[in-house]
């Protein structure tokens, strides 16, 4: 069961896996959740009754029964990991800890104007896990305003001490706020010859890359495939680092693959969820249980539902044996990866899907789309919403995109003259406008947040957030789209679609069925040539065919320009403005979402 509350003055006895240092019990709970085996924890807060060397210790614990005996102890705070919970989990920690010095390897020291600037520096430094900043009130003159960037093997401090007039905090890489490049490419026949910080077994290079991503010290990796000549190294995933943050040497070697940590892309691609099945593959590890199961899918479900299960191997039933049920071996290991991977034994293996909730919901694969045609099918664009106004009569006003369970991203110009959110209704999971009747459920709007710098669409900043009165329950027909990663600024998107219920020509009416059109992106230089009277800024992105013919039109405003990249859909643009509709050499102009990721996160993550 899911227990989220913390138990004050309580200590769990036994079951210790390891001890780390965290600045709060809340963060200890997050560390426990992300640890492959931790189910419970005990944190020691600062207290006069407690030995200062034990302050801020976070003891990670495991138990076969998923619980441990409780003992009363002042200053101890205990709790359970969120592994047992079904809700979305994030490692993002924006808290700043006053008068705490988080110890680690101080590898960079520089002057910063503020703790925020220091945190930004840490977030944009590939090695940085956390920082300590000496404020301008710090007693030692030469250390004032000094920003120390730190890293450790575990990503958590090696110790935490009280120190007046300093503040500490963590890198915000896990909050999608890093400007570091997001390099998704996997390089075949390549070995990165840098120092290994760890090695694990993995079934393929993609899993290896995802493991590297959530390993605190891993910056890049090399994976030896099952065809690698040296048998003892087959399926070996080497997690690597270097001082520069980049591989120093690349060696051409057949049957090896290399790539980079996806820490700067983690909010727009799955990094925890290993959802594939590996046929004719056996995962070895500590056996947790052996259960009868009808299929490998059923076995994966059993593993996902067993909180301690990390991976599984399913052996299909021998003809008519055991009511056609095979054996499902539920397994675990100290690091969450198989201790060995064997091939040719007929097993089907895979991983728990419990970790998928640590990934952004937007990375979930949606059903295959129908190619060709202009009318969409149900569930094809599950993030698309229709925004209605009830004044003077109810009608479709604009499109919008679900980006969170309480948030719609749309265009600011949709709210021309709108004084109150009370007249707005958001309908999700809609294909045809005719589905909307008086009794159709909708989301009321609690707040309209328009970008402070917005004046008119053509001047830019044409972006707005709608905070919904109630939360959206994600289903196949209504789910979020990923925001682009800031590290993806240089990605060239080639599979982009504009969707909406807008006019199909200049003098027309709102369409009943959601329309779609594949439209190529146009460079800003090219776009500027087509709009001499306007300033096309880097905060705008353009899309259209030179000959015209396909474009957004009236009623499409606020809707998404969705681009598929590495199997994940990203909200690249918001339909904003254009000269006419689908005119020759007049591309549509869209709000360039990647330039507003900070603004979006600031508004949606505000307390």
């Amino acid at each position: 069961e899911c227990v989220t509350q913390l138990l004050k003055d309580t200590c769990f006895e036994g079951g210790d896996i390891t001890t780390v240092f965290t600045p709060s019990a809340k963060y200890c709970q997050v560390v426990c959740t992300y640890h492959p085996r931790c189910l419970l924890f005990t944190f020691t807060a600062e207290s006069p009754s407690e030995d200062p060397t034990r302050w801020f210790t976070c003891v990670l614990k495991d138990s076969v029964t998923e619980t441990l005996p409780r003992v009363n102890r002042t200053a101890a705070i205990s709790g359970y990991s969120f592994k047992q919970c079904s809700h979305q989990i994030s490692a993002c920690n924006k808290d700043i800890y006053v008068d705490l010095d988080m110890k680690g390897i101080n590898y960079n020291s520089s002057v910063a104007k503020s703790a925020q600037e220091c945190q930004e520096r840490c977030t944009d430094d590939v090695h940085c896990h956390f920082f300590t900043y000496a404020t301008r009130q710090f007693p030692s003159l030469e250390h004032r305003n000094i920003c120390l960037l730190k890293h450790t093997q575990t990503g958590t401090p090696t110790r935490i001490t009280k120190l007046d007039k300093v503040v500490s905090g963590f890198s915000l890489k896990s909050c999608a706020l890093s400007n570091l490049a997001c390099i998704r490419d996997i390089f075949p026949n390549t070995v990165f010859a840098d120092s290994n910080i760890d090695s694990v077994m993995a079934p393929d290079a993609f899993v290896c890359g995802r493991i590297c991503t959530h390993h605190p010290g891993c910056l890049f990796f090399t994976f030896f495939s099952q065809e690698w000549p040296k048998e003892s190294q087959r399926n070996l995933c080497l997690l690597k680092t270097s001082e520069s943050g980049l591989p120093s040497t690349r060696i051409k070697k057949s049957k090896a693959l290399s790539g980079f940590s996806l820490q700067s892309c983690r909010h727009s691609i799955p990094v925890f969820c290993h959802s594939s099945f590996y046929h004719d593959t056996d995962f070895l590890g500590e056996e947790l249980d052996i259960v009868a199961a009808k299929s490998h899918e059923a076995c994966q479900k059993l593993c996902t539902n067993a909180v301690r299960c990390q991976f599984f191997t399913y052996t299909p039933a021998q003809a008519s044996c055991n009511e056609g049920k095979g054996k499902c071996y539920l397994k675990l290991s100290s690091n969450g990866s198989p201790t060995k991977i064997l091939h040719g034994r007929g097993g089907i293996s895979g991983y728990t899907l419990r970790l998928c909730k640590m990934d952004n919901e937007c990375t979930t694969k949606i059903k295959p789309r129908i190619v060709g045609g202009t009318a969409s099918v149900r569930g094809e664009w599950p993030w698309q919403v229709t925004l209605h106004t009830t004044s003077p009569t109810q009608r479709h006003l604009c499109g919008g995109s679900i980006i969170g369970n309480q948030w719609i991203l749309t265009a600011a110009h949709c709210f021309y003259g709108v004084e109150s959110p009370k007249i707005l209704r958001v309908y999700s999971g809609i294909l045809n406008q005719s589905e909307i009747k008086e009794d159709t459920s909708f989301f009321g709007v609690q707040e309209i947040i328009i970008h402070d710098q917005y004046k008119m669409a053509e001047s830019g900043y044409d972006i707005a957030l709608l905070k919904l009165e109630t939360t959206v329950n994600y289903t196949d027909s209504q789910r979020p789209i990923c925001l682009p990663s800031k590290g993806d600024r240089n990605v060239i998107y080639t599979d982009c679609w504009v969707t909406g219920w807008g006019y199909r020509k200049l003098r027309d009416k709102i369409q009943n069925t959601l329309q779609k059109a594949k439209i190529p992106l146009v460079t800003n230089e090219e776009c500027q040539k087509r709009y001499r009277g306007h300033k096309i800024t880097h905060k705008m992105i353009c899309a259209g065919y030179r000959e015209g013919g396909k474009d957004a039109c009236k009623g499409d405003s606020g809707g998404p320009l969705s681009c598929k990249h590495n199997e994940v859909w990203h909200l690249v643009g918001i339909t904003s403005w254009g000269e006419g509709c689908a005119q020759r050499e007049r591309p549509g102009v869209y709000t360039n979402v990647v330039e507003y990721v900070d603004w979006i996160l600031e508004k949606t993550q505000a307390v």
């Epitope: 003077p392 110009h413 021309y416 003259g417 917005y454 008119m456 499409d556 006419g580």
Partner: antibody, heavy 118, light 111 residues
Framework: QVTLKESGPGIVQPSQTLNLTCSFS??????????VSWIRQPSGKGLDWLAH???????RYNPSLMSRLTISKDTSRNQVFLMITSVDTADTATYYC??????????WGQGTLVTVSS | DIVLTQSPASLAVSLGQRATISCRAS??????????MNWFQQKPGQPPKLLIY???NLGSGVPARFSGSGSGTDFSLNIHPMEEDDTAMYFC?????????FGGGTKLELK
């Protein structure tokens, strides 16, 4: 509630500079999205938009009069000003200030009549 | 500049009847969501009063006998049923781009 009130000299001589003041209450020009425009109307004729000032001191002018117009504001005193240089009889009109947020001109002042005459 | 042409220049309508005023723009005043066309009423010695914004939305406190329609370049204001109090000048105005411009006006009288 929102109110705006224009004030001006009443009569101004040709080639002189006309200074107008718009005093308002019920809103602040430091609020994001807020702006105030000047619009004029010669007697018995149509309306001409002249200039607009935004909360962030960004300004817009009617290109046909741009060289003669200067709009400014004093946010703390809730006032917007318009200066028109080198006036002539064609500038005789009722001058209105109007509030424009992220929408239309929803609130107008009563207007002030300005006559250009020697 | 976007030029707005109103027609007719003047109009006389009987009590209870329908009055229709047209406004044509020299180029589209639509963007991908909104028709940036507004309508104002002005009585002698008074400032203009907002009637309709974004082509069809009623201004605050405006009676429901006023309605607006249109998109792109062609717009109209309808008053039905005509009342004595509706005798005034009516102006259309575009908010699509600077310079914001007004139509020449239509004088509505009681027949």
């Amino acid at each position: 509630q929102v109110t705006l009130k224009e004030s001006g000299p009443g009569i101004v001589q040709p080639s002189q500079t006309l200074n107008l003041t718009c005093s308002f209450s019920g809103f602040s020009l430091s609020t994001s999205g807020m702006g105030v425009s000047w619009i004029r109307q010669p007697s018995g004729k149509g309306l001409d938009w002249l200039a607009h000032i935004y909360w962030d001191d960004d300004k817009r002018y009617n290109p046909s009069l741009m060289s003669r117009l200067t709009i400014s504001k004093d946010t703390s005193r809730n006032q917007v000003f318009l200066m028109i240089t080198s006036v002539d009889t064609a500038d005789t009109a009722t001058y209105y200030c109007a509030r424009k947020g992220r929408g239309p001109f929803a609130y107008w002042g009563q207007g002030t009549l300005v006559t250009v005459s020697s | 500049d976007i030029v707005l042409t109103q027609s007719p220049a003047s109009l006389a309508v009987s009590l209870g009847q329908r009055a229709t005023i047209s406004c044509r723009a020299s180029e589209s005043v639509d963007n991908y969501a909104i028709s940036f066309m507004n309508w104002f009423q002005q009585k002698p010695g008074q400032p203009p009063k907002l009637l309709i914004y974004a082509a069809s939305n009623l201004g605050s406190g405006v009676p429901a006998r006023f309605s607006g329609s249109g998109s792109g370049t062609d717009f109209s204001l309808n008053i039905h049923p005509m009342e004595e109090d509706d005798t005034a000048m009516y102006f259309c105005q575009q908010d699509k781009e600077v310079p914001w411009t007004f139509g020449g006006g239509t004088k509505l009288e009681l027949k």
